[in-house]
């Protein structure tokens, strides 16, 4: 395929990345999964311009990022290194709480109110926001 | 090894230019955003100037604004400070740094610019 | 612009002290501010961004904490490498701005 040239419609561009914004709630596997179909993949952060280009238009809302740590390690879902990655967990977190009753721990990153990260259960509705990187190749046959 | 180096640093009269310049290697450049900050002798740090990795965002000091001019070469791995109407207050020691978990995480070992007549 | 204030301006410390630095905001930054070391006649060093997380290589004995306006940087056992001078900066508006600086002296 050839590289994308522009966003897709109703996704935001930033440094040559595209993003979208959810406006409903999904368990984060559901969301990992609508991203995967849009030839995307959940947010990966890696730089506070991109922290705070995110943190700007989810707004102080509980929203998923593509971060976890259900096969035991912290991974980003794109292979960024998790351990010198950027990190903006709150104090004390993550912290596997096991309090919620829910069952097992906390094993999925999401964006709090104030920006900053926290792990909570997977099987939260919350919003994501999904990333497409501008310069790999698209997916779409090219035109004849 | 991420390293950044400074150059063009040097003697100037007040309303001369410079052309400083940071060659970087060890990490994709093109990948990250770039600062310059400055230390006048015995003072502390003063941010200067700020570019994108794709230089479609650039922020100056209101003190240089309209005198300086940032830009980059992804394919040479440089950055780059035009400073022109130098003024005696602009005399200090030119870092440029990388941005990636905060605007300043690497830097590099400065270049020494001394304006004066 | 955010003027970025530190205190104390300098403190004298004995290796193994505990060391707690403090930088307040003119207005609030949220949680984006960075910590610096530098040495004389050398370049800074960051060693703490967003408030409270540990750069790269940079020993755990440092630490951030804060958010708003008012932020800290605890150094829980003083070693001889850290006598030097170390610098708040806040990232969350342009112009990005510096505080003056804190001096950690040998007692």
């Known amino acids: 395929g050839s590289e994308r040239t522009c966003c897709p419609v109703n996704w935001v561009e930033h440094e040559r990345s595209c993003y979208w914004f959810s406006r409903s709630g999904k368990a984060w596997a559901d969301a990992d999964n609508y991203c995967r179909l849009e030839d995307a993949h959940l947010v990966v952060v890696t730089s506070w311009e991109e922290q705070k280009f995110v943190q700007h238009h989810i707004g102080p809302v509980n929203t998923w990022m593509g971060l976890h740590d259900q096969n035991g390690p912290w991974k980003w879902v794109d292979g960024t290194d998790y351990e010198t990655g950027f990190k903006n967990w709150r104090p004390e977190q993550p912290d596997d709480w096991y309090g919620h009753g829910l069952g097992g721990g906390e094993d999925c990153a999401h964006f709090t109110d104030d920006g900053r990260w926290n792990d909570d259960v997977c099987q939260r509705p919350y919003r994501w926001v999904c990333e497409t990187e501008l310069d790999k190749a698209s997916q779409e046959p090219p035109l004849l | 090894e991420v390293q950044l180096v400074e150059s063009g640093g040097g003697l100037v009269q007040p309303g001369g230019s410079l052309r400083l310049s940071c060659a970087a290697s060890g990490f994709t450049f093109s990948t990250y955003s770039m600062t310059w900050v400055r230390q006048a002798p015995g003072k502390g740090l003063d941010w200067v100037s700020y570019i994108s990795r794709s230089s479609s965002t650039i922020y100056y000091a209101d003190s240089v604004k309209g005198r300086f001019s940032i830009s980059r070469d992804n394919a040479k791995n440089s950055l780059y400070l035009q400073m022109n109407s130098l003024r005696d207050e602009d005399t200090a020691l030119y870092y440029c740094a990388r941005s990636a978990f905060s605007p300043f995480d690497y830097w590099g070992q400065g270049t020494l610019v001394t304006v004066s007549s | 612009d955010i003027q970025m204030t530190q205190s104390p301006s300098s403190l004298s410390a004995s290796v193994g002290d505990r060391v707690t630095i403090t930088c307040r905001a003119s207005q609030g930054i949220s949680h984006y501010l960075a910590w610096f070391q530098q040495k004389p006649g050398k370049a800074p060093k960051s060693l703490i961004y967003v408030a409270s997380s540990l750069q790269n290589g940079v020993p755990s004995r440092f630490s951030g904490s804060g958010s708003g306006t008012d932020f800290t940087l605890t150094i829980s056992s003083l070693q001889p490498e850290d006598f030097a001078t170390y610098y708040c900066?806040?990232?969350?508006?342009?112009?990005?701005?510096f505080g003056g600086g804190t001096k950690v002296e040998i007692k």
């Open positions: 900066q806040q990232y969350n508006n342009y112009p990005l701005t």
